[in-house]
């Protein structure tokens, strides 16, 4: 019985290969701190396998625990620039549905020009992740300096 | 039919367990910014399961999407040292085959003595990853301060 | 034969879904540099699936290679504070059993207020991971600023 049960759980598509790696498309208008992302092979090395983009924000399609990671580098930045414009802060969170709104990951730049981090977090189908950059400095659009991704880890 | 198909996809070796975690062996000669890595249980907690080392650079053996991560700490470093020697930059990229050469991940130290980041990226069998450290400071060889690794995530 | 062999390897619980994401509970008494962690759905987005907490330290239940990640943010911190209180250092290591004691991951704050990193490392059933924060600054208990987790990757 247990043997047969295992089989039903394990066709390839049920293994939860959901994964996405995005590159920065653009920043929002003045009062919108969100970063807008894009992904797909035509753009280079970014991709979406499972999750989708909804107006530049990442929407989850499969319930589970995900590894969320991000790196953001500020454009034309030195440690002097970064400290002068402090606080510049990046926050990754669930922004919709509103009932599940929460900050998942938050970092300040202080005297650095790059932040990078990652964490495990439960996400549900329909959760939309937003990345808010507050401050007066622009993020770099270089694909090796600024990126955002998720990886499904387990149910 | 689907049931039988799943079985053919799922023997252990086909699950793509390819993974490697490397420690710094040495830096290159003067005009070579590459870091040279080593791995294996005899060296401590580093290992290669799938990928191989080719003259200190990591070569991929299985196509797929990989999580690439790195941490580099500068030796005998303070925030004063780091800012004085700016720009000290680390870049991780595909360096061969030449047709696939690209920078995957780039960070500057600014006033810090450690950089750490990670990203998802598609890699193909035969891709060789190089880690270039530009600047006039030495990377620490302590295994808990400087390391580089990859983990196969999905086809 | 290979077909049957695959089945034996792949019941769900044998896939090694062990994973944990913890939030800071409290710091230790004066001479104890360890951070004490907590996890569970009642606390928010932290969880333990496989590993356990032993007096606030994370104990591993399954042998394998793990991705270990951490982010620690210092409370009420500016780059001036951080540099003034240097060295403030975070180390993640195996603290028991004593025979396996080793530092796995080490970072200093220098002029920053957050450190974040990750690495792959072999861990064995019974290994207890400790996170030591040395210095005179308190870590933030905000769940989006300070967290610690592990993810089983392969046998």
């Amino acid at each position: 019985q247990r043997f047969a049960q295992a089989q039903q759980q394990l066709p390839l598509e049920s293994l939860g290969w959901d994964v996405a790696e995005l590159q920065l498309n653009h920043t929002g208008p003045q009062q919108d701190p969100r970063l807008y992302w894009q992904g797909g092979p035509a753009l280079g090395r970014s991709f979406l396998h499972g999750p989708e983009l909804d107006k530049g924000q990442l929407r989850i399609h499969r319930d589970g625990i995900y590894m969320v990671h991000i790196q953001v580098t500020l454009a034309i930045c030195s440690s002097t620039t970064a400290s002068r414009h402090h606080p510049t802060t990046l926050a990754v969170g669930i922004c919709s549905p509103a009932s599940r709104s929460i900050s998942l990951l938050r970092l300040s730049f202080h005297q650095g020009c790059t932040i990078a981090s990652q964490r495990l977090t439960p996400l549900a189908r329909g959760d939309t992740l937003c990345t808010n950059l507050t401050g007066t400095l622009l993020p770099s659009r270089n694909t090796d300096e600024t990126f955002f991704g998720v990886q499904w880890v387990r149910p | 039919q689907r049931f039988a198909q799943a079985q053919q996809q799922l023997p252990l070796e086909s699950l793509g367990w390819d993974v490697a975690e490397l420690q710094l062996n040495h830096t290159g000669p003067q005009q070579d910014p590459r870091l040279y890595w080593q791995g294996g249980p005899a060296l401590g907690r580093s290992f290669l399961h799938g990928p191989e080392l080719d003259k200190g650079q990591l070569r991929i053996h299985r196509d797929g999407i990989y999580m690439v991560h790195i941490q580099v700490t500068l030796a005998i470093c303070s925030s004063t040292t780091a800012s004085r020697h700016h720009p000290t930059t680390l870049a991780v990229g595909i360096c061969s085959p030449a047709s696939r050469s690209i920078s995957l991940l780039r960070l500057s130290f600014h006033q810090g003595c450690t950089i750490a980041s990670q990203r998802l990226t598609p890699l193909a069998r035969g891709d060789t990853l190089c880690t270039n450290l530009t600047g006039t400071l030495l990377p620490s060889r302590n295994t808990d301060e400087t390391f580089f690794g990859v983990q196969w995530v999905r086809p | 034969q290979r077909f049957a062999q695959a089945q034996q390897q792949l019941p769900l619980e044998s896939l090694g879904w062990d994973v944990a994401e913890l939030q800071l509970n409290h710091t230790g008494p004066q001479q104890d540099p360890r951070l004490y962690w907590q996890g569970g759905p009642a606390l928010g987005r932290s969880f333990l699936h496989g590993p356990e907490l032993d007096k606030g330290q994370l104990r591993i239940h399954r042998d394998g290679i793990y991705m270990v990640h951490i982010q620690v943010t210092l409370a009420i911190c500016s780059s001036t504070t951080a540099s003034r209180h240097h060295p403030t250092t975070l180390a993640v290591g195996i603290c028991s059993p004593a025979s396996r004691s080793i530092s796995l991951l080490r970072l200093s704050f220098h002029q920053g207020c957050t450190i974040a990193s990750q690495r792959l490392t072999p861990l064995a059933r019974g290994d207890t991971l400790c996170t030591n924060l040395t210095g005179t600054l308190l870590p933030s208990r905000n769940t989006d600023e300070t967290f610690f987790g592990v993810q089983w990757v392969r046998p």
Epitope: - | L24, Q30, T73, A75, I76, T80, R84, H85, T136, L137, L138, S140, R141, N142, E145 | -
Partner: antibody, heavy 120, light 111 residues
């Protein structure tokens, strides 16, 4: 190949000051600390201090008790060492030196040395 | 300050023979997986010349009869087969912290 060329020998009175120059060839001058070392006749080597020409930051050996001042002129790729309140025991050969690739305090390139004689 | 002590103060070795000079630091000069110990050769009227850096790395252009070893506090410079042009004073130096300091020197002569 970097070359460091120092100014010529000096004879000074006790209590006076001396300023020794060190001109570097090549375009890497601002990126490497320039160190100054003292070698008294028949004696060993003593590190005096260093300057990072990129921003003028200095570090000094406490043994010289504030008598040494290091400066640098990026426009001419020249470093200077001034030693004040001279006394007879300051009679020595003074060297400028720097590393070739990594900017740590070991010394690949050396000036030819400048003999400073302090005598009344 | 870290005190560097060389031994012997002077050494006479026959041509073609091995010469060994030792250097002891008053505390460890190892950090970050490196030993910040270096060796120089100085001939009369010349500035010192770097032979070995980071304990065991041969500086470019230095003959491979020179080698360095050691870690922590104890280090050795070895000349495997002494040549006439190797007559000089040899200094060890650390750069683990400021100020960097030198040994008192070892005078190497031909026996």
């Amino acid at each position: 190949e970097v070359q460091l060329v120092q100014s010529g020998a000096e004879v000074k009175k006790p209590g006076s000051s001396v300023k020794v120059s060190c001109k570097a060839s090549g375009d890497t001058f601002p990126r490497y600390n320039m160190h100054w070392l003292k070698q008294a006749p028949g004696q060993g080597l003593e590190w005096m201090g260093a300057i990072f020409p990129g921003n003028g930051e200095t570090s000094y050996n406490q043994n010289f008790k504030g008598r040494v001042t290091l400066t640098a002129d990026k426009s001419t790729s020249t470093a200077y060492m001034e030693l004040s309140s001279l006394r007879s025991e300051d009679t020595a050969v003074y060297y400028c030196a720097r590393n070739s690739y990594y900017d740590y305090a070991w010394f690949t390139y050396w000036g030819q040395g400048t003999l400073v004689t302090v005598s009344s | 300050d870290i005190v560097m002590t060389q031994s012997p103060d002077s050494l006479a070795v026959s041509l073609g023979e091995r010469a060994t000079i030792n250097c002891r630091a008053s505390k460890s000069v190892s950090s970050s997986g490196y030993s910040f110990m270096h060796w120089y050769q100085q001939k009369p009227g010349q500035p010192p010349k770097l032979l070995i850096y980071l304990a065991s790395n041969l500086e470019s252009g230095v003959p491979d009869r020179f080698s360095g070893s050691g870690s922590g506090t104890d280090f050795t410079l070895t000349i495997s087969s002494l040549q006439a042009e190797d007559v000089a004073v040899y200094y060890c130096q650390h750069s683990r912290e400021f100020p960097p300091t030198f040994g008192q020197g070892t005078k190497l002569e031909i026996k």
